[in-house]
């Protein structure tokens, strides 16, 4: 059984795989940063297991994570964001496994929002726009965005477009007429920070016009 022995014998705990992954979110709540960690193995018995971060902190040596169901979480202004911190899984005072991590290399941006698509009849195109909270941030301002769209009936045939701006034009002739499309967007740090893709934005759905038979163009 996963987990450590209740009688204080740590042998069982040492046999378990306590590998974990973390991501940071900078200025996620005003000037506060967050750090989220979770075990790779969803079946790890997390009873009595704690996470702690030490080093590269302001005014304190170490900070303890709060446990929220299966994830471990810190929200604080105390990340120096310079150099490496040591993140450890602990049981009592004993460290089971640790990782040295620079928090600026595991940044996960916030998901883009307000995604919308406007059809321009005269231009025969669709203007895709979305917003990101990162435009207002001090640190993670430069992002690469991944816009993905598909015809709703094509379950797994997503077309991806990478862009650094928050506006994209899709040409009408590249899309099927009279079809329903789903579109969504996510972001990843680009320049100065490294990390992971954000969650996807909520999807937006739009319909392409029908073909006008006389001209061969879409209505």
């Amino acid at each position: 059984e996963s987990g450590y022995a209740q009688n204080g014998d740590l042998e069982d705990a040492e046999l378990d795989d306590y590998s974990f992954s973390c991501y940071s979110q900078l200025e996620v709540n005003g000037s506060q940063h967050s750090l989220t960690c979770a075990f790779e193995d969803p079946d790890v018995n997390t009873t009595n297991l704690e996470f702690e971060i030490c080093g590269a902190l302001v005014e304190v040596k170490c900070l303890n994570f709060r446990k929220l169901q299966e994830i471990y979480f810190i929200e604080t202004k105390k990340f120096l964001l310079i150099g490496k911190s040591n993140i450890c899984v602990k049981v009592g005072e004993k460290s089971l496994t640790c990782k040295k991590i620079d928090l600026t290399t595991i940044v996960k941006p916030e998901a883009p929002f307000d995604l919308s698509v406007i059809y321009r009849e005269g231009a025969n195109d669709f203007v895709v726009t979305f917003n990101t909270s990162h435009l207002q941030k001090k640190y993670v301002k430069v992002l690469m965005h991944d816009v993905a769209y598909r015809q709703e009936k094509d379950e797994n045939k997503w077309t991806h477009v990478n862009l650094s701006s928050t506006k994209l034009t899709l040409l009408q002739r590249k899309l099927q007429p009279a079809a329903m499309y789903e579109i969504k967007v996510r972001s990843i740090p680009d320049h100065y920070f490294k990390g992971f893709w954000s969650e996807w934005s909520p999807s937006y759905y739009f319909r392409t016009p029908e073909i006008n038979n006389s001209s061969g163009e879409m209505d």
């Epitope: 030490c54 080093g55 590269a56 040596k61 964001l81 310079i82 150099g83 490496k84 911190s85 040591n86 040295k100 620079d102 600026t104 290399t105 640190y139 320049h191 100065y192 920070f193």
Partner: nanobody, 118 residues
Amino acid sequence: EVQLVESGGGLVQAGGSLRLSCESSISTFSSDAMGWFRQAPGKEREFLAAIGWSGAVTHYSDSVQGRFTISRDNAKNTVYLQMNSLKSEDTGRYYCAEDYDTDVWQYWGQGTLVTVSS
């Protein structure tokens, strides 16, 4: 074997400026934090400024905030300290350090001497 070499020190008038450089031969330079410290005669070494691996994040001590600027050029494996409005109390040996790992700087240079005359 020499891994961090500081340069740019010298004698300068109060109110003047100097730019210190620190060249690293450490292979992980572009992913390491860098810092500048100074040791005044008869005093302990004190932290002045630090910069993250990409240059996006900097941190300064209160004593130099607004007067000193730390920057880096990862293509040249070099970190800089631009020092303006120098005061006599800025006199000392200036050291650069590399790889801030769990509150310990792993590598140190030999230092360069700065003298500010009033």
